[in-house]
């Protein structure tokens, strides 16, 4: 999906209002210095591309993020403010259904959410360079 035509201000507002709080709740008990951020993003479409991939693509070390509240809200926000996004997300929905139902928060999932927080913060800071 090409995130170029999203309403970035509305996504930013949704992030600040709800998604950020859910991410921070997920990370409760850990310090921001506990994990080293190894990925970043260049501009807002890039940030959303990586946020979407990291949130919804299960990895061997952390398969369950797509079931979390912040992921559900992220999906709803992107569907609301990115034209045509929801039509592209049928496969992602299947991935969510297949994700482990376990609510155990592993250290690797905490690390992945720490990376997500970094990408979201970069999204907020970054001026849109490509329209």
């Amino acid at each position: 999906y090409d995130f170029t035509n999203c309403d970035f201000q509305k996504i930013e507002a949704d992030y600040l209002r709800t998604i950020s709080k859910d991410l921070i709740t997920y990370m409760s008990g850990t310090k921001s210095t506990d994990f080293n951020n190894t990925v970043s993003c260049s501009n807002r479409p890039h940030c959303l591309t990586e946020i979407q991939s990291l949130t919804f693509n299960p990895t061997p070390r952390c398969a369950s993020l797509a079931k979390e509240m912040f992921a559900r809200k992220t999906k709803a926000t992107l569907a609301l403010w990115c034209p045509g996004y929801s039509e592209t997300q049928i496969n992602a929905t299947q991935a969510m259904k297949k994700a482990r139902k376990s609510k155990v928060t592993t250290n690797k999932c905490l690390e992945q959410v720490s990376q997500l927080l970094g990408l979201w913060r970069r999204f907020i800071r970054t001026l849109l360079k490509k329209q």
Epitope: T38, V39, N43, T49, N57, T59
Partner: antibody, heavy 117, light 108 residues
Framework: QVQLQESGPGLVKPSETLSLTCAVS?????????WSWIRQPPGKGLEWIGY???????SYNPSLKSRVTISRDTSKNQFSLKLSSVTAADTAVYYC??????????WGQGTLVTVSS | EIVMTQSPATLSLSPGERATLSCRAS??????LAWYQQKPGQAPRLLIY???SRATGIPARFSGSGSGTDFTLTISSLEPEDFAVYYC??????????FGQGTKVEIK
Amino acid sequence: QVQLQESGPGLVKPSETLSLTCAVSGYSISSGYGWSWIRQPPGKGLEWIGYISYYGSTSYNPSLKSRVTISRDTSKNQFSLKLSSVTAADTAVYYCARTNLLYFDSWGQGTLVTVSS
Amino acid sequence: EIVMTQSPATLSLSPGERATLSCRASQSVSNNLAWYQQKPGQAPRLLIYDASSRATGIPARFSGSGSGTDFTLTISSLEPEDFAVYYCQQYSDWPEYSFGQGTKVEIK
């Protein structure tokens, strides 16, 4: 300390597919960062080809996107480049590098690929 | 596409002298700029990122400055091992990251 080493054929015929592999040691490619390919034609500057992130997202240079595929094999801790329909203009030293998806902090030594019949 | 232009193409200096290399972007890249050093037959090495932050293990004689479209890499006092080609790279314009054409710092 992370180390990267490129390997693959040094000679590829025009219209064929160039295939290179980057073996990574000292760091798991599924633990963090992105893993990128960059090339440098003889005597010229650098050109970013693309990356695959530790969680599997890919991004390619738009000028090469239709011909490029970057994939990974986490069991072997390596990632690969395929560049199809090559011409003499694809002759270059190809580098693999570790990236935070912005800039490149560790590089392989590079491998020269010549496109010629 | 953002075009990165480096000047001069070649800089002839003696060890101990100060080197000032310029990189200009065709449009603003904020501080999204890196500098690399490349010696003959070797891979590039990251020197500076975010326009002014030194990469791990890079000596303090290397410094970067600038924002927007004009950037400078300064080597305060050239050591023999500093004679090489230097490239700038913008990472503001994903997915069209681009490098400058390079500045060669040679021994006078």
